[in-house]
């Protein structure tokens, strides 16, 4: 499933929105990492357009901010990308998923560096 700013022509929706999302997920990434967030819709069906919001501001897809169906990817993350992210139903602003993202200054260490 490719991410990017390409447009998706959407067909009819299968379901009406499901229940409210649970508590927010807390995620930590290293500087330079790609922040990847996934938010499958409740009930599994599309529910109209969605928007990713960071600290109250809607995110517009760009070369660094990639949006796919129910997915967000922020490339080459830095400390400024830390914050509260939510995936919302565009029409009602109903929160579908909630994430607390922290980007640490140090790059994340790979598994191959352990025990060397």
């Amino acid at each position: 499933e490719s991410l990017g700013t390409e447009q998706r022509v959407v067909g009819r929706a299968a379901e009406v929105p499901g229940p409210e999302p649970g508590q927010q997920e807390q995620l930590v990434f290293g500087s330079g990492d790609a922040v990847e967030l996934s938010c499958p819709p409740p009930g599994g069906g599309p529910m109209g357009p969605t928007v990713w919001v960071k600290d109250g501001t809607g995110l517009v897809p760009s070369e660094r901010v990639l949006v796919g169906p129910q997915r967000l990817q922020v490339l080459n993350a830095s400390h400024e990308d830390s914050g509260a992210y939510s995936c919302r139903q565009r029409l009602t602003q109903r929160v579908l998923c909630h994430f607390s993202v922290r980007v640490t200054d140090a790059p994340s260490s790979g598994d191959d560096e352990d025990g060397e």
Partner: antibody, heavy 121, light 110 residues
Amino acid sequence: EVQLLESGGGLVQPGGSLRLSCAASGFTFSSYDMSWVRQAPGKGLEWVSGIYSGDGSIYYADSVKGRFTISRDNSKNTLYLQMNSLRAEDTAVYYCAKDGPMNEESRFDYWGQGTLVTVSS
Amino acid sequence: QSVLTQPPSASGTPGQRVTISCSGSSSNIGNNYVSWYQQLPGTAPKLLIYADSKRPSGVPDRFSGSKSGTSASLAISGLRSEDEADYYCASWDYSLSGYVFGGGTKLTVL
């Protein structure tokens, strides 16, 4: 001041094509969702298509699906509607409408003045 | 026939309060917000109410919106002659994956 200026309307024969443009100014065009809404003479409003910035999705009314294509050029602050295989029932004033901020509830908060499309032989 | 049902006409005298209804279903009004638009003769529509009951800046508080279940209403109090216009309700419809408008209500100020 937000301004939306439609152009490209006119008289076209059934089966023909037309491309409408909507030049936007007074706001950060790329950050806003946009729609086309039409109104046949003496009739009510009908939503035609919408293009959504937040997830890149595009939606169409059943009546135009497969015939009309919505697109945008953010570098030119312009919204387009490519209309193919036009029918008499597509005759209407076509309005370009701007949605509210992405982090607020959806609504058409600004409208252009409209451009008339007449499909007739 | 429109997905959202509005009375074709309504009327009132200056100073009166009039209400315009908009009836839908669970796939639109029942699970989504309603917005209302005013269209004066020969002009483009203008946003009056969004998110069921919110008023954009510049819209007089004589205009108010409400919703219950799958129906919504627009109320205009202190009716004025300049309120004579067509009024449309709108909502997203999940089963159609698109916006739907009511057929419109022509308001006459007697």
